[in-house]
């Protein structure tokens, strides 16, 4: 867990000719506010896609009235930082959108009017706990200068906020195998409580015994890279022998949305539509008041003076959702089926279908295996709108053309050591265990508990798994 912090330094005309007109006037005084939207990874996503890492709205800036005849100066800014709390690990790579909004304070019927002045976006790499990073972005004739950083909330530390720190139990040193927590040298790393074997680079845990994967990794121990899987289904879990993602539960199975939120699948993941009073990626944030600025895109917050009374966001035209977080466009009606991506071409809508689907609305499930060949003795398996090759041992990938590492999923039980072999894998069992995967304990009286060792092999000898 941690907080992404954004400090806006200035917003004003950029260099060069064509200075923008001041957004405010004596007749129409206005003030600025900012919205930041964060998404994990470096994906090129539409501005309207969910802010999966979180979003924040600044306070309103001071009222500004243009001086007649004067060029537009840097405009007065709201005080303070924009802070976006993140609950899980910091992904290290992220995309951001920063919007500059104008609130007009003239005699508007029905209250103030909001309009988007500028939107900048970018993709960055950032380690948590590092120094402030400075940036300049231009949107048309406007220029935005800002700094940002990600910091972990105690007891989390590290570049991804996945290591936990605890105060030292002894004054001089940390316990065995535990390092001091830089920069908190008076604290020690907490003992690892994740599931045994959980990848330290690609996995993390918040509860003892669990192993949750960072974006781009899957499998029970977060050791299988999603990107190298060539199976076409975007769903986990992983297949131990092929390193390939096989169709599994959908992102909405088991409803990841808390507090009565409803889940809908998106081309990349899922989206929660939260009931009033809750927001966040999984509707996990509650106790929100209007003072927290929960209404995005210029939505007007009503009620919610204290955490026990729900707020209501009155959305400006063109936005919807309990927090006005969703832009209403012609793709909002979700014409594309089976995870197809909707593209508004202006004169018409088009669906870009996921592999294995076709038709104007991606409504046709293709004959998955027609004309498909699986190499190296693999067989084609239909299902889920995307053909999948069930590969022979030692091979993986979409068409079984890649050599697979059969040991990647740590198949040898009870501390057995795995060796890749031309025909699969070999487990060298720890003393006291036997079996192809070292799954059977050897009884003290010398009899094994099923099955008997093949002739010529002593318990504990490496056995080839065919």
């Amino acid at each position: 867990a941690g907080v992404f912090e954004l400090q806006i330094h200035s917003f004003g005309p950029g260099p060069g000719p064509g200075a923008p007109r001041s957004p405010c006037s004596a007749r129409l005084p206005c003030r600025l506010f900012f919205r930041v939207c964060l998404k994990p990874g470096l994906s090129e996503e539409a501005a309207e896609s969910p802010c999966a890492l979180g979003a924040a709205l600044s306070a309103r800036g001071p009222v500004y009235t243009e001086q007649p005849g004067a060029p537009a100066p840097d405009l007065p800014l709201p005080d303070g930082l924009l802070q976006v709390p993140f609950r899980d690990a910091w992904p290290g790579t992220f995309s951001f959108i920063i919007e500059t909004w104008r609130e007009e304070l003239g005699d508007q019927i029905g209250g103030p009017a909001w309009s988007l002045l500028a939107r900048v976006a970018g993709r960055r790499r950032l380690a948590a706990g590092g120094p402030w990073a400075r940036d300049i972005q231009r949107a048309g004739a406007w220029e935005l200068r800002f700094s940002y950083r990600a910091r972990c909330e105690p007891p989390a530390v590290g570049t991804a906020c996945t290591r936990l720190c605890r105060p030292r139990s002894a004054p001089s040193r940390c316990g065995p195998g535990l390092r001091p927590c830089a920069p908190l040298e008076d604290e020690c790393e907490a003992p690892l409580v994740c599931r045994a074997g959980c990848s330290p680079e690609h996995g993390f845990c918040e509860q003892p015994g669990e192993c949750r994967c960072l974006e781009g990794w899957t499998g029970p121990l977060c050791t299988v890279p999603v990107s190298t899987s060539s199976c076409l289904s975007p769903r986990g879990p992983s297949s131990a022998t092929t390193g390939c993602l096989v169709p599994g539960p959908g992102p909405c199975d088991g409803n990841p949305c808390a507090n009565g939120g409803s889940c809908s699948e998106t081309p990349r993941s899922f989206e929660c539509t939260c009931p009033r009073g809750f927001y966040g990626l999984r509707c996990e944030v509650s106790g929100v008041t209007c003072a927290d600025g929960p209404c995005f895109n210029g939505g007007l917050c009503v009620g919610g003076a204290d955490p026990d009374s729900a707020y209501i966001c009155h959305c400006p035209p063109g936005f919807q959702g309990s927090n006005c977080e969703k832009r209403v466009d012609r793709c909002s009606l979700q014409p594309c089926r089976n995870g197809g991506l909707c593209l508004d071409l202006g004169h018409a809508l088009r669906c870009r279908c996921r592999a294995g689907f076709a038709g104007p609305r991606c409504e046709h499930d293709l004959d998955d295996c027609a004309g498909r060949a699986c190499a190296n003795g693999g067989t084609c398996v239909e299902g889920g709108g995307a053909h999948r090759c069930s590969c022979a041992l030692g091979f993986g990938g979409r068409d079984c053309r890649e050599r697979a590492d059969p040991c990647a999923a740590r198949p040898c039980a009870h501390g057995g050591r795995c060796y890749a072999h031309f025909s699969g894998l070999v487990c060298a069992c720890a003393p006291g265990y036997m079996g192809a995967r070292c799954e059977f304990p050897v009884h003290p009286d010398g009899a094994s508990a099923l099955p008997a060792a093949p002739p010529g092999l002593r318990p504990g000898d490496p056995q080839r798994y065919l």
């Epitope: 035209p317 012609r330 909002s332 009606l333 979700q334 014409p335 004169h347 018409a348 809508l349």
Partner: antibody, heavy 120, light 107 residues
């Protein structure tokens, strides 16, 4: 032949609710959105909202949020408009009109209209 | 919301006349608009979609043109059955909006 057949006229008291139906035939119901349009006596047309029958996703005109609910029953190829807490100003003819979900043709086929009269 | 300003609000014409109705959108709508015909006591009927395309079964004397924010419906030779109300509608952006209507009456 494409047809949209709406339910009959309704006379309701203020505060009551009404549910207008629009039964579609002659085309694949889930391939076309359904729009609802209001026409008050002697007035022009006013768009109320739209529903995707395949997914049930709706978008409302912000003037018609709250008391107005659009829904569909895919098994009977029927779209519904429900209005609760009726007021005198809800007196109007309500039309359903289909619209292609991708090519965005304008509303090419319309129901015959359902007159809703709200009077005490 | 996009405003659709239709003119004239009414016109009188004779059979055989060429009639032109215009619609101006408060912002560009890229041809995402249509024209509807409504006769008294009847439901509207689609005439034109995408600014210039005739709906199935609509006589060729009806035509649509325009781009950006300005669009025109033309009836090249008015027929007795064409006396009705005509509406433009934009479907570029939610909420969809209609013009105020043009009543075409017999002179």
């Amino acid at each position: 032949e494409v047809q949209l057949v709406q339910s009959g006229s309704e006379l309701k008291k203020p505060g009551a609710s009404v549910k207008v139906s629009c039964k579609a035939s002659g085309y694949t119901f889930t391939d076309y959105y359904m729009n609802w349009v209001k026409q008050a006596p002697g007035q022009g047309l006013e768009w109320m909202g739209i529903i995707n029958p395949y997914s049930g996703v709706t978008i409302y005109n912000h003037k018609f949020k709250g008391r107005f609910v659009l829904s569909v029953d895919k098994s009977s190829n029927t779209a519904y408009l429900q209005i609760s807490s009726l007021k005198a100003e809800d007196t109007a003819v309500y039309y359903c009109a289909r619209q292609d979900s991708l090519l965005d043709y304008a509303m090419d086929y319309w129901g015959q209209g359902t007159t809703v009269t709200v009077s005490s | 919301d996009i405003q659709m300003t239709q003119s004239p609000s009414s016109l009188s014409a004779s059979v055989g006349d060429r009639v032109t109705i215009t619609c101006h959108a408060s912002q560009g709508i890229s041809g995402n608009m249509g024209w509807l015909q409504q006769k008294p006591g009847k439901a509207p009927k689609g005439l034109i979609y995408h600014g210039a395309n005739l709906e199935d079964g609509v006589p060729s004397r009806f035509s649509g043109s325009g781009s950006g924010a300005d669009y025109t419906l033309t009836i090249s030779s008015l027929q007795p059955e064409d006396f009705a109300d005509y509406y433009c509608v934009q479907y570029a952006q939610f909420p969809y909006t209609f013009g105020g209507g043009t009543k075409v009456e017999i002179k």
